[in-house]
Interface confidence: low
């Protein structure tokens, strides 16, 4: 063991006074006590008594459910962490004399910290929000507001935002626009069909009428070779009040691009709140 006076002789007292050094430089896995270096206790053991000039450091193994995870001079071992099942915790890895017990959360819960001292119930995403990332044992559910064209009408820890129903693919029309919390409401396209069919029918009738007029003209042709009298173009009048005439197709007013997405009060980001065990 190197004593302080010896160091003073070796390095020079003046040098020590100008550049104060530790009384002695102990090696790795040693500690300084009473101006001498003693061995640290190895992991899994605690210190019973410091070394002296004549004796080595005395160490004792940690007891059941205790541990020390470093080379140390601790006089007491640490208690293994207790994974309290009443608090939603369970043992992920049993502790040894050199390692602590690692706790994790029961199914449906996640740790709030790396140390996993607490568990929180996986957060549910409120209506208007969908699950972006499902919770794991160490991370909470990540929610995101449903963008325009998507909705969520439930509070869920698993459901993503669903796309609005496409009425067109079902040969239906949008009767009520969707929001971030509600789907669009589709309905039969009676009005639309009428708007399309009626002009077609009248178009056909008009064509038939033209053909009839043409046939009539041909039938009236004189048989002699006299020059044709100059014919005035025949004016065909359609009454203005015919259904479908002069009727503009209705503009389907949609809120695409301007759906209000409102962050619900109290949602983080509880938090919910979240339930936490």
């Amino acid at each position: 063991m190197v004593r302080l006076p010896l160091q003073c002789v070796l390095w020079g007292c003046l040098l020590t006074a100008v550049h104060p050094e530790p009384p002695t430089a102990c090696r790795e896995k040693q500690y300084l006590i009473n101006s001498q270096c003693c061995s640290l206790c190895q992991p899994g053991q605690k210190l019973v008594s410091d070394c002296t000039e004549f004796t080595e450091t005395e160490c004792l193994p940690c007891g059941e459910s205790e541990f020390l995870d470093t080379w140390n001079r601790e006089t007491h071992c640490h208690q293994h962490k207790y994974c309290d099942p009443n608090l939603g915790l369970r043992v992920q890895q049993k502790g040894t004399s050199e390692t602590d017990t690692i706790c994790t959360c029961e199914e449906g819960w996640h740790c709030t910290s790396e140390a996993c001292e607490s568990c929180v119930l996986h957060r549910s995403c409120s209506p208007g929000f969908g699950v972006k990332q499902i919770a794991t044992g160490v991370s909470d559910t990540i929610c995101e507001p449903c963008p325009v064209g998507f909705f969520s009408n439930v509070s869920s820890a698993f459901e993503k935002c669903h796309p609005w129903t496409s009425c067109e693919t079902k040969d239906l029309v949008v009767q009520q626009a969707g929001t971030n919390k509600t789907d669009v409401v589709c309905g039969p396209q009676d009005r639309l069909r009428a708007l399309v069919v009626i002009p077609i029918i009248f178009g056909i009738l008009f064509a038939i009428l033209l053909v009839l007029v043409f046939i009539k003209k041909v039938a009236k042709k004189p048989t002699n070779k006299a020059p044709h009298p100059k014919q005035e173009p025949q004016e065909i009048n359609f009454p203005d009040d015919l259904p479908g005439s002069n009727t503009a197709a209705p503009v389907q007013e949609t809120l695409h691009g301007c759906q209000p997405v409102t962050q619900e009060d109290g949602k983080e980001s509880r938090i919910s709140v979240q339930e936490r065990q």
Epitope: G88, T112, L121, I271, V273, E275, R276
Partner: antibody
């Protein structure tokens, strides 16, 4: 406006069961943990227990067999099974603001006074 | 359950002065500590959470700090309206939400 209000506090004789009600407005009990705290006249605050958003209840060790917390969609009840004179206090209901920190309550009711006397 | 030992039980300060209130946790509570202010006839009001975060609407003269298991509330530049009783509330961030209040510190403004 988010608020909580306690009711049901009155003068009771020892042993007569009593239920206090905390009515919440402006937020949902399915999103927050709620706590009950009491304060005896001239004394400090004492934590009784909580009810989680899922409806799980947790009590202080001393309160376990004496109090029961339950809830509906808009109310949280605290039942005192068999009040003693030591239960004379103002009872507060409070919302736990963040689920990851059990100590932090942002909204408190004004309290309701329970007097137990023969 | 955790035990919170709050000191002093009462203190006084002049307007503009500084007040320090301490809370010692019987074991590690990982910064799960809040400070509350209570005036007579009123419910407690949250001042500090997570040991050092200032609650919404609370003046910046209130601050909190932590050193191991000792937590401190400091009021710098005390105002007359700060006369109240202050409580710490510590607890485990666990499912049981088990918490304990300190005994309280009554602050008198001279």
């Amino acid at each position: 406006c988010q608020s909580v209000e306690e009711s049901g506090g009155r003068l009771v004789t020892p042993g007569t069961p009593l239920t206090l009600t905390c009515t919440v407005s402006g937020f949902s009990l399915s999103d927050y943990v709620m706590r009950w705290v009491r304060q005896a006249p001239g004394k400090g605050l004492e934590w009784i227990g909580v009810i989680s958003s899922a409806g799980n209840t947790y009590y202080a060790t001393w309160a376990k067999d004496r109090f029961t917390i339950s809830k509906t969609s808009t109310t949280v009840d605290l039942r005192i099974a068999s009040p003693t004179t030591e239960d004379t206090a103002t009872y507060f209901c409070a919302r736990i603001w963040r689920p990851d920190d059990p100590t932090n309550s942002d909204i408190w009711g004004p309290g309701t006074l329970v007097t137990v006397s023969s | 359950d955790v035990v919170m030992t709050q000191t002093p039980s009462s203190t006084s300060a002049a307007v503009g002065g500084t007040v320090t209130i301490k809370c010692q946790a019987s074991e590690s509570i990982s910064s799960s500590l809040a400070w509350y202010q209570q005036k007579p006839g009123q419910p407690p009001k949250l001042l500090i959470y997570y040991a050092s975060d200032l609650a919404s609407g609370v003046p910046s003269r209130f601050s909190g700090s932590r050193s191991g298991t000792e937590y401190t509330l400091t009021i710098s530049g005390v105002q007359r309206e700060d006369a109240a009783t202050y409580y710490c509330l510590g607890g485990y961030a666990t499912a049981a939400y088990r918490t304990a209040f300190g005994g309280g510190t009554e602050l008198e403004i001279l």
